[in-house]
Amino acid sequence: EPPTACREKQYLINSQCCSLCQPGQKLVSDCTEFTETECLPCGESEFLDTWNRETHCHQHKYCDPNLGLRVQQKGTSETDTICTCEEGWHCTSEACESCVLHRSCSPGFGVKQIATGVSDTICEPCPVGFFSNVSSAFEKCHPWTSCETKDLVVQQAGTNKTDVVCGPQDRLR
């Protein structure tokens, strides 16, 4: 694509190239043959994050605590506010407009990856030799107890939801 009539950081208006406003500023008036582009800084709680010819700055995002949101990074005149979720919650979308409670892994499943402010808990089924008997957002699958190391024998086999039950070895008479 060949270059356009105006250079980078310029825009074409009424047969002339005007300078764009820098990030953090909005357009007040276009340049003329005799005057430069006039720009003004964005107000409190406003921002523009690109070289622009916008006549209004964007409002910073509001992190609504009623939706489980809190401020992760305060906005500036050049950046939007970044929201994240309260402890135990995660964002429902990349834009993080609302939060949902982290899911718990049911008995028979363990936590593969603990949830963050932006991603949910990832569960995995407990493989043979492991179990989880609780619904939890933190607990991994636990290995079955090794009866042998305790000089005991398996009295009841373990499942993905229950540990093995160990008991004393039968004595020879």
Epitope: P2, P3, T4, A5, I13, N14, S15, Q16, C17, E33
Partner: antibody, heavy 116, light 107 residues
Framework: EVQLVQSGAEVKKPGESVKISCKAS????????IEWVRQMPGKGLEWIGV????????NYNEKFKGQATLSADKSISTAYLQLSSLKASDTAVYFC?????????WGQGTLVTVSS | DIQMTQSPSSLSASVGDRVTITCRAS??????LNWYQQKPGKAVKLLIS???RLHSGVPSRFSGSGSGTDYTLTISSLQPEDFATYFC?????????FGQGTKVEIK
């Protein structure tokens, strides 16, 4: 005094090309855009495109993309409009104009007649 | 593309008359509206740029006004040399577009 002097009238056959020149004087050639406009017989004005003579950047009207080519030679303060694959319907007066706030100064126009 | 609708397409007036030509854009053009005068065999002349700014050398009987989509060119007292065709043109959004013209004739 700002002046834009265009090349003389042209008669072309369908399918041929034409290159019109527009020589600027009386101002800094690279400081202003050059616009090109078409006026068909008895009709209104139609914008073709614009060139920045400083570095050759262009914008075209979609309608003329592929048929019109704008260029400029800084060393002789001259802008050019080339039209290819001419048709009878391309018969018109072609104007160059200097930008600024609007089309501030115009050339006298170049009549291109396309006829077999 | 932005459509520019000029009215009237022609008018007859006498020397000394006040003449008004209007131009309506199909969308807001933020005052980037220019007026031109064309006479047969002569170079086109810019009269007014950016709605109301008189181009250098243009007599003060010419004036422009308007905003948004509606714009007006006024000649306060028509002179013999003002008989010509007038065009409006928007410079807000590519492609630049022109009104179809208003021919001002002698009554």
């Amino acid at each position: 005094e700002v002046q834009l002097v265009q090349s003389g009238a042209e008669v072309k056959k369908p399918g041929e090309s034409v290159k019109i020149s527009c020589k600027a004087s009386g101002y800094g050639f690279t400081n202003y855009l050059i616009e090109w406009v078409r006026q068909m017989p008895g009709k209104g004005l139609e914008w073709i495109g614009v060139i920045n003579p400083g570095y050759g950047g262009v914008n075209y009207n979609e309608k003329f993309k592929g048929q019109a080519t704008l260029s400029a030679d800084k060393s002789i303060s001259t802008a050019y409009l080339q039209l290819s694959s001419l048709k009878a319907s391309d018969t018109a007066v072609y104007f160059c104009a200097r930008g600024g706030s609007g089309f501030a100064f115009w050339g006298q126009g170049t009549l291109v007649t396309v006829s077999s | 593309d932005i459509q520019m609708t000029q009215s009237p397409s022609s008018l007859s007036a006498s020397v000394g008359d006040r003449v008004t030509i209007t131009c309506r854009a199909s969308q807001d053009i933020s005052n980037h509206l220019n007026w031109y005068q064309q006479k047969p065999g002569k170079a086109v002349k810019l009269l007014i740029s950016s709605t109301s700014r008189l181009h250098s050398g243009v007599p003060s009987r010419f004036s422009g006004s308007g905003s948004g989509t509606d714009y007006t060119l006024t000649i306060s007292s028509l002179q013999p040399e003002d008989f010509a065709t007038y065009f409006c043109q928007q410079g807000n959004t590519l492609p630049w577009t022109f009104g179809q013209g208003t021919k001002v004739e002698i009554k």
